[in-house]
């Protein structure tokens, strides 16, 4: 579909005569009839197959025809067609004299014709005007013409229909050749497919309008490339949705159990050394001068009972001082001015002379001690219970009440799954609250480091479901990078999402 446009520019009839040579009275009031038809080698009369058009009287004798298109007038003349433009045409332009106001062919005398021109040729669709001039013995006509496509028609023959749109069915404008040109943010054959936010994950994200990234279930983040861990997962991550893989130092199904209390809470005070001993369990090894479960108590220098023979100890800033009872002297009241004659031994102790009677020594009965057998034995004084165990006096004996995770007479033994050295080939054993874990040296693997592995851990193709295998050069083990939809250390398990979970 298109329009053949004819622009009449100038008509010259200086003598004001008709084609017959007879002059017009009073002058030649001139109008034009145009016939457009298919190509003929010799243009002959007959139907105007492409269309006809007539003008009103445009002038008398010689005149210029002004461009009247802007004012809604009839120049250029429009000859619309509703078919594919064939690229060739024939054109007949007749100039007529109108004696009266009726311009119909039947109302005119046959000799009212002033001039007739006929041309034919090829004409391509385009915006450029072709200028032509036709001269006869008495008249001259200057004109130009072109063929353009109707609105929404494109291509060399105006045969390609394209109507720009921006709705659910497409988002495009039309190129000069009639092909679609998508509006920014749209793609696809009919520009119906939005271009998502740059970087939006192909599988895990989608969009309904340009520059958007909406996440499919189980994924989150601006680009939908972060999986959502299992609801309730505390100190864990995921590689596929709804997993919960514990961070270092955490255990339990939801990674909410502290396996590294020392690092996470630093419970030991005053520079003490902390050792993890299971879930929420630890042991502090105190520096000299400190005691208590968390080494929070400062030991007094008098706690070691340095004063002998019943001397009383007084703490001082720079140490301690012994106040000796009568008959004793020295830094620790260790020297006596008494002899066995003074009956210095208490609680049934036996006195023995020393240095020819200048000194003595007491031999104490059970449960008493001291230079003069003056002290009842407190078997807990020496803090014999290790690892924070509580010492209990039981008459002549004592016993240790151990903290969880320890055993033995003095709580010196750590109850440990690692005690039986389960890790082979020099593997390092780690106690966990709910089991043990072996860290294997290079060249070994397996739950207990019992499997000798080759240097290229991927040589045996251990990964399933087209997963990519990587060799960890530091441990000679392999890591499987699973494709979407598979999990497991070897990517052997397809992911299944239970319908009973709301997420």
């Amino acid at each position: 579909s298109g329009v053949f446009q004819l622009q009449l520019q100038e008509f010259i009839n200086e003598r004001g005569v008709l084609a017959s040579g007879r002059p017009c009275e009073p002058g030649c009031r001139t109008f034009f009839r145009v016939c457009l038809k298919h190509f003929q080698a010799v243009v002959s009369p007959g139907p105007c197959t492409f269309g006809t058009v007539s003008t009103p009287v445009l002038g008398t004798n010689s005149f210029a025809v002004r461009d009247d298109s802007s004012g809604g007038g009839r120049n250029p003349l429009q000859l619309p067609f509703n078919f594919t433009w064939p690229g060739t045409f024939s054109l007949i332009i007749e100039a007529w004299h109108a004696p009266g106001d009726d311009l119909r062919p039947e109302a005119l005398p046959p000799d009212a014709l002033i001039s007739k021109i006929a041309i034919q040729g090829s004409l391509a669709v385009g915006q450029n005007w072709l200028l032509d001039e036709q001269t006869s013995t008495l008249t001259r006509l200057r004109y130009s013409y072109r063929v353009i496509c109707s609105d929404n028609y494109y291509g060399d023959n105006c045969s390609r229909l394209c109507k720009k749109r921006n709705d659910h069915f497409g988002h495009y404008v039309c190129q000069p050749d009639g092909n679609l040109s998508c509006l920014p943010g749209w793609t696809g054959e009919y520009c119906q497919q939005p271009i998502c936010l740059s970087g939006c994950h192909e599988q895990n994200g989608y969009c309904s309008k340009p520059a958007e990234c909406l996440c499919r279930p189980g994924w989150q983040g601006r680009l939908c490339n972060e999986c959502i861990p299992h609801n309730g997962c505390r100190h864990g991550t995921c590689s596929t949705p709804w997993q919960c893989t514990c961070d270092e130092g955490w255990g339990g199904l939801f990674c909410d159990q502290d396996l590294n209390y020392c690092t996470h809470h630093s419970p030991c005070k005053n520079g003490a050394t902390c050792s993890n001993s299971g879930q929420r369990s630890y042991t502090c090894t105190c520096r000299p001068g400190y005691t208590g479960v968390d080494c929070e108590l400062e030991l007094s220098e008098c706690d070691s009972n340095p004063c002998r023979n019943g001397g009383s100890c007084k703490d001082q800033e720079d140490g301690y001082h012994c106040l000796c009872p009568p008959g004793y002297y020295g830094l620790h009241c260790e020297h006596s001015t008494l002899s066995c004659a003074d009956s210095p031994c208490f609680n049934g102790g036996s006195c023995r002379e020393r240095n020819q009677g200048a000194n003595y020594a007491c031999e104490c009965p059970p449960n008493f001690t001291g230079s003069n057998c003056e002290k009842k034995v407190d078997r807990c004084t020496s803090n014999p219970c290790a690892n924070g165990g509580q010492c209990l006096n039981r008459g002549p004996s004592r016993m240790c009440r151990c903290r969880p995770g320890f055993t033995g007479t003095y709580c010196e033994l750590h109850v440990s799954d690692c005690a039986r050295n389960p890790c082979a080939h020099g593997g390092t054993c780690h106690d966990l609250e709910n089991g043990l874990m072996c860290t294997c040296p290079a060249g070994f693997s397996g739950r207990r480091c019992e499997v000798r592995t080759s240097i290229d851990a991927c040589a045996s193709s251990p990964c399933f479901n087209r997963a990519t295998c990587y060799t960890d050069l530091s441990t000679d083990t392999f890591v499987c990078n699973c494709p979407y939809g598979f999990v497991g250390s070897r990517c052997e398990f397809p992911v299944g999402l239970p319908p009973s979970f709301p997420w």
Epitope: C233, Q243, T245, W250, G251, L253, N434, G435, S489, E492
Partner: nanobody, 120 residues
């Protein structure tokens, strides 16, 4: 394909007992730790306890300690949750799960769940 199927749920009176079973398939059963968690309507899931791959190590949440016991029969590829002295607050859907490793550290697979209702 890893599959965990729970059974044994139902309605029980306060103070009563119930034993849940979890039948496993699709993996080497004695390589993986197995645990139980539960979820009451409108609440976050709560880990109940777990048993290591060998069965030598178990742990329990404080809320069920002394009342619930987890055991496993590697010959039958089954884990059990024995629940005694049940309380109304134990009402939930109970799921068995595995981290996919020998120690109880996380969740990678879980079953469809079985409903336990404690009510008089």
């Amino acid at each position: 394909e890893v599959q965990l199927v729970e059974s044994g749920g139902g309605l029980v009176q306060p103070g009563g007992s119930l034993r849940l079973s979890c039948a496993a398939s699709g993996f080497t059963f004695d390589d993986y730790a197995i645990g139980w968690f539960r979820q009451a309507p409108g609440k976050e899931p709560e880990g109940i306890g777990c048993i290591s791959s060998s069965g030598g190590s178990t742990y329990y949440a404080d809320s069920v300690k002394g009342r619930f016991t987890i055991s496993r029969d590697n010959a039958k590829n089954t884990v059990y949750l024995q629940m005694n002295s049940l309380k109304p607050e134990d009402t939930a859907v109970y799921y068995c799960a595995t981290p996919g490793i020998a120690a109880c550290r996380g969740i990678h697979y879980w079953g469809q769940g079985t409903q336990v209702t404690v009510s008089s």
